[in-house]
């Protein structure tokens, strides 16, 4: 691999890192406008392809949605083939992304929705480690807008693991978000909705290249965290959205200094939801193991504000609303490490459930 | 394994054009189509340079050193990215790199370019 990049725009300076969290308390419940769906039939399954992402919209007074479950905002039309291939997809044709991979309708896809009270506690799950993720400034990383989220490159070296022999190497972290007025974050918890949510993607060390894990049970892991307003500033997370403004337009990638990636995670790693699931964009391939943290990040107003207004996306659109609705668990069990659900007897149920990567 | 393959490069004249390839090979799945793609540089003695991005949407993103002279496009179905470089100059003159990112950084191994009279 090359050495030595010099990005298409200046070099950007340090800040300093510090994290703020909080509990997924009573506070995050849902509010009337982000009401739960409807329970599942009785044979467990869930409704086909949408949740109650529609009534929420319609509710919000969102009039210019292109499909049921996702605004139109944030990436113009979908499909328009520019010839040559292209394999076009946006947030506002998610129903379309069959055609542009099959696996996009597949049983056990993500976002879902988290609901408390059917989680699975699980004694199994133990707190995650996470190896290396307190970056130098150098060697730099590359942040980029590639028209669909803000990504982060993670350096080789980073080394999270699961469990005991489940272990995975961080590839890339990336955000997804909503707009000054409506939240974006891609999983809920009980129909609710947070401002943003972080994902840093893993690959297993079983895989050498990510082609090999794509679609592979446990092949790719991914760690997300809700992002939530407070009136303090994230500092760890001001040295990322204080370079957006570099990389506004499609396309656009810089440098910037190592940062501290553990501090964009919440502290507490060991109460967390578990399920399997899919990428949440296109190809959309199945066998990834979501770990959801209970404890939330949390930036300021302004902070989520910058997130949601400094990116552009294709054809002059604002790259906003960049999530993909939640998806029917098809009889998945969401797995806790801890009692989630308010109900939850003193004995864990559904011991059985416990599933392990890769199983 | 995957592998990313340049071709097309060689020696031209100051204000000739050349027309870079890079193909895609190996992959199971074909990753290639949902990765922003992009050529890079290296000039003797230089630090790596982004020269062009093509995203999965078909949007182009171009260094300030070749705008207007250098156009990056992708063909998903053959799965190669290009670059035509028109009103060549002696400091084009690099080892250009392609690149994939999805997820992963995939690299070539890179084809020479030498602009000079």
């Known amino acids: 691999q090359p050495q030595g990049l010099s990005g298409m725009q200046g070099e950007p300076s340090l800040g300093d890192s510090s994290s703020g969290e909080d509990e997924l308390g009573v506070d995050v419940l849902p509010s009337e406008e982000d009401a739960p769906e409807e329970a599942d039939p009785p044979d467990g399954e869930d409704p086909p392809e949408v949740n109650s992402e529609d009534r929420m919209e319609e509710s919000l007074g969102l009039e210019d949605l292109s499909t049921p479950e996702a605004p139109e905002h944030s990436q113009g039309s979908h499909g328009d083939e520019k010839g040559g291939g292209h394999s076009h997809w946006s947030y506002g044709g998610t129903l379309l992304w069959p055609q542009v991979s099959p696996a996009c309708a597949g049983r056990f896809q993500s976002p879902v929705d988290i609901r408390l009270e059917r989680t699975a506690f699980c004694r199994t799950l133990q707190p995650l480690e996470l190896l290396g993720y307190e970056l130098q400034p150098l060697p730099e990383l590359s942040l980029s807008n590639n028209g669909h989220t803000v990504q982060l490159t993670l350096p080789p070296g980073l080394k999270m693991a699961l469990g005991p022999g489940q272990e995975y190497r961080a590839l890339q972290l990336h955000l997804h978000w909503g707009t000054s007025d409506h939240p974006g974050s891609e999983h809920t918890v009980n129909g609710h909705r947070f401002p943003a949510e972080i994902h840093v993607v893993h690959l297993s060390t079983a895989f050498s290249e990510l082609h090999e894990a794509l679609g592979r049970p446990g092949g790719l892991a991914v760690l997300a965290a809700f992002l939530q307003e407070s009136p303090e500033e994230n500092s760890a997370y001001e040295q990322l959205l204080s370079h957006l403004e570099e990389i506004s337009e499609e396309g656009s990638k810089i440098e910037i200094p190592g940062l501290d990636v553990s501090a964009l995670l919440p502290s507490d790693l060991s109460r967390y939801y578990r399920y399997e699931g899919s990428l949440t964009t296109p190809p959309c391939s199945q066998g990834v193991i979501w770990t959801v943290f209970n404890e939330t990040v949390k930036l300021s107003a302004k902070q989520l504000h910058t997130l949601s207004v400094s990116l552009w996306g294709p054809r002059d659109s604002r790259l906003q609303l960049n999530f993909r609705a939640t998806q029917p668990l098809n009889g998945r069990t969401i797995e806790a490490s801890f009692p989630a659900a308010e109900d939850s007897s003193p004995e864990p149920v559904h011991v059985n459930s416990c599933f392990t990567a890769g199983d | 394994e995957v592998q990313l393959l340049e071709s097309g490069g060689g020696l031209v004249q100051p204000g000739g054009s050349l027309r870079l390839s890079c193909a895609a090979s190996g992959n199971s799945v074909n990753i290639f189509s949902f990765a922003a793609m992009s050529w890079y540089r290296q000039a003797p003695g230089k630090g790596l340079e982004l020269v062009a991005v093509i995203t999965t949407t078909g949007g182009t993103k171009y260094s300030d050193s070749v705008k207007g002279r250098f156009t990056i496009s992708r063909d998903n179905s053959k799965n190669t990215l290009y670059l035509q470089m028109n009103s060549l100059r002696a400091e084009d003159t690099a080892v250009y790199y392609c690149?994939?990112?999805?997820?992963?950084?995939?690299w070539g191994q890179g084809t020479q370019v030498t602009v000079s009279s």
């Open positions: 690149n994939a990112d999805y997820l992963q950084d995939y």
